[in-house]
């Protein structure tokens, strides 16, 4: 569904930084585009609550109207609430902006559950804790919606950071990041560090929490440890990548790698879970259950529905396996793997049992639209969206939640043959890009 699973996700306080910083390796730093080193003004510019989305503060219009905007690498429209709604504290008031221009065109975006619709226009946009620029960008002013905004989420709009091909109503509507790069000298790259809470937050903590960083125009080396490994962007629509192998605690799922990418694999900050195609999900759950077989958990837990609670501080992380995804590397027949811990795929849920309990939902779920590497994956890593070089980079996040025995990892290279065969070729029809069901 769009809610809770597809769009909204959100996370709170940053986990503890790694105790040991790995020495920086001289990988490809000299080749990295954009400003290098420190982007102090952009660090910690995201906020969030687990399961409800990470948002950045933006201003629109003249004089500037401040709104919190969900950061979504799985869509391509900049869309903001522009009419009163019970779940919105504030909204974009076009009539108060002297720089608003009406495009006299409507836009309608249906999801599997829910929808939003609105009117297209342009206005001046800036990001206070981002680059010091103002750009004229397309804005969809949301006038009607259903199951889109989330009560208490604290965001009022969505910033789609993917490519024009999936923009609504069509690919002629230039996405925000394209406008930003065209109108400024900002390099065509951004990076995300999403910091999961790692433990349930009460409402007070959640409201005051730091969620992470969106670095626009480059890479901040303080946000990761070790080296960055890059995987090619297969096609510029979603941020599509190719998974070549999946392991649970080092055990290969041994599936035809096409299954892992059926019908695509994308990196999506607007999705909470790691979502897997049906066959892959079933095999992965079977393997995770086997690895944690000293315990039995309720059936509804594996469906992402029931919560499992442990006395505070006693969650048995060690009985749950790590999950490794091998991604196509930049070099022929070379891959690398990213490994997440149960601290990433068991999502803390606040305010359900007693304060003496830590409660979690299983945040791996089934998909009918391919693999979605959502927050569950991204919260383990610093993720670089290097649009200029058509690649996505992964490094271990300096804020990922872990324990004294295991940490998330990005490792390589591994020799993997015939990786091109792992990609699924979607039959092209006129309708193919109209499937916005983000269930």
């Amino acid at each position: 569904t769009h809610l809770g699973i597809r769009l909204p996700l959100r996370s709170g306080l940053a986990g503890p930084p790694l105790g040991l910083r790995l020495p920086r390796e001289t990988d490809e730093e000299s080749e990295e585009p954009g400003r290098r080193g420190s982007f102090v003004e952009m660090v910690d510019n995201l906020r969030g609550k687990s399961g409800q989305g990470y948002y950045v503060e933006m201003t629109v219009g003249s004089p500037p109207q401040t709104l919190n905007i969900l950061v979504d690498t799985g869509s391509s429209n900049f869309a903001v609430g522009a009419a009163p709604h019970p779940f919105l504290h504030r909204y974009y008031q076009r009539q108060l902006s002297s720089t608003y221009r009406d495009l006299r065109k409507g836009v309608y975006v249906p999801y599997t559950q829910g929808k939003w619709e609105g009117e297209l226009g342009t206005d001046l946009v800036s990001i206070p804790h981002g680059p010091n620029v103002t750009v004229r960008a397309n804005i969809a002013a949301i006038t009607e919606s259903d199951k889109f905004f989330i009560n208490g989420s604290n965001w009022e709009g969505i910033l789609g950071l993917a490519y024009a091909e999936i923009a609504r109503p069509d690919d002629s509507l230039e996405p925000f990041f394209d406008s930003l790069v065209k109108q400024t000298h900002i390099p065509n790259i951004f990076s995300l560090q999403l910091c999961g809470a790692g433990f349930p937050l009460n409402q007070t903590e959640a409201l005051a929490s730091v969620g992470g960083s969106m670095i626009i125009g480059g890479i901040d080396h303080s946000l990761y440890t070790g080296r960055l490994w890059y995987t090619p962007i297969r096609r510029e629509w979603y941020y599509e990548v190719i998974i070549v192998r999946v392991e649970i605690n080092g055990q290969d799922l041994k599936m035809d790698c096409k299954e892992y990418n059926y019908d695509k694999s994308i990196v999506d900050s607007g999705t909470t879970n790691l979502r897997l195609p049906k066959k892959v999900f079933e095999a992965a759950v079977k393997s995770i259950k086997a690895a944690s077989s000293t315990e039995k958990f309720p059936d509804g837990f594996w469906l992402g529905e029931q919560l499992v609670c442990w006395q505070a501080g006693t969650t048995p992380w060690n009985i749950f396996p790590v999950i490794s995804l091998y991604l196509m590397g930049e070099v022929t027949n070379q891959s690398f793997r990213i490994t997440i811990l149960p601290q990433q795929y068991l999502r803390p849920v606040e305010d359900v049992a007693t304060s003496q309990d830590d409660c979690y939902k299983f945040a791996v779920s089934q998909s009918s639209t391919g693999t979605v590497m959502g927050a569950v994956i991204m919260e383990g890593f610093y993720v670089v969206f290097d649009r200029a070089r058509k690649r996505i980079g992964f490094a271990v996040s300096a804020c990922h939640v872990h324990d004294e025995f295991r940490t998330a990892a990005v490792e390589g290279p591994f020799v993997t043959a015939d990786m091109e065969d792992c990609g699924y070729n979607i039959p092209q029809t006129d309708e193919s890009t109209l499937m916005t069901g983000r269930a």
Epitope: S293, T294, E295, K296, F297, P298, D299, G300, F301, E305, Q306, L307, V308, C309, D351, V352, A353, C359
Partner: antibody, heavy 120, light 108 residues
Framework: QLQLQESGPGLVKPSETLSLTCTVS??????????WGWIRQPPGKGLEWIGM???????WYNPSLKSRVTISVDTSKNQFSLKLSSVTAADTAVYYC????????????WGRGTLVTVSS | EIVLTQSPATLSLSPGERATLSCRAS??????LAWYQQKPGQAPRLLIY???NRATGIPARFSGSGSGTDFTLTISSLEPEDFAVYYC??????????FGGGTKVEIK
Amino acid sequence: QLQLQESGPGLVKPSETLSLTCTVSGGSISRGSYYWGWIRQPPGKGLEWIGMIYYSGSTWYNPSLKSRVTISVDTSKNQFSLKLSSVTAADTAVYYCARVGHGVSYFDLWGRGTLVTVSS
Amino acid sequence: EIVLTQSPATLSLSPGERATLSCRASQSVSSYLAWYQQKPGQAPRLLIYDASNRATGIPARFSGSGSGTDFTLTISSLEPEDFAVYYCQQAYVWPPRTFGGGTKVEIK
């Protein structure tokens, strides 16, 4: 068909340890689809979950009783047991053993129950 | 902590009448809710699980409905053997340790 039967002393002195055993007949306790639990009911009152155990020995306890409760399993005898230490009159209740089925979420089969009175 | 509140505490009805029992959760438990029947001197018996599924051997006159926070157990036409105490239990937060306080259905 599967049956559960509680056994143990009906009278326990204050500060002592209450010990009960549940014998499972008509099926194996080692079947992986179930937990095996204890629930109690003070006279004239509602139901209180005490805890449960998996055949592997993994246990889950009610936080309010955790410091005093031990549940164990003996797969060779097809039995699981409850020990509740430092009992007081407030622990007087009918004690039921039950199977936790339907996705290990509900108590789908119960023993008849045994009344344990705490009194000197 | 999730609290289950059952109402009414006592329901006085005649055989053949329809009984409607309510269980309200302090926060959503999705559809992870069960109903049990307990007759005097007997152990509870599972009637309904997952809000609306009848357990094995339970007569069709018993039905459950609801999701989220509000649930109902309906006995379409009371038989003499249905006069008992009924408990609800949630399993959304697991382990499943929360029961409601009970509703007594007595003969009017």
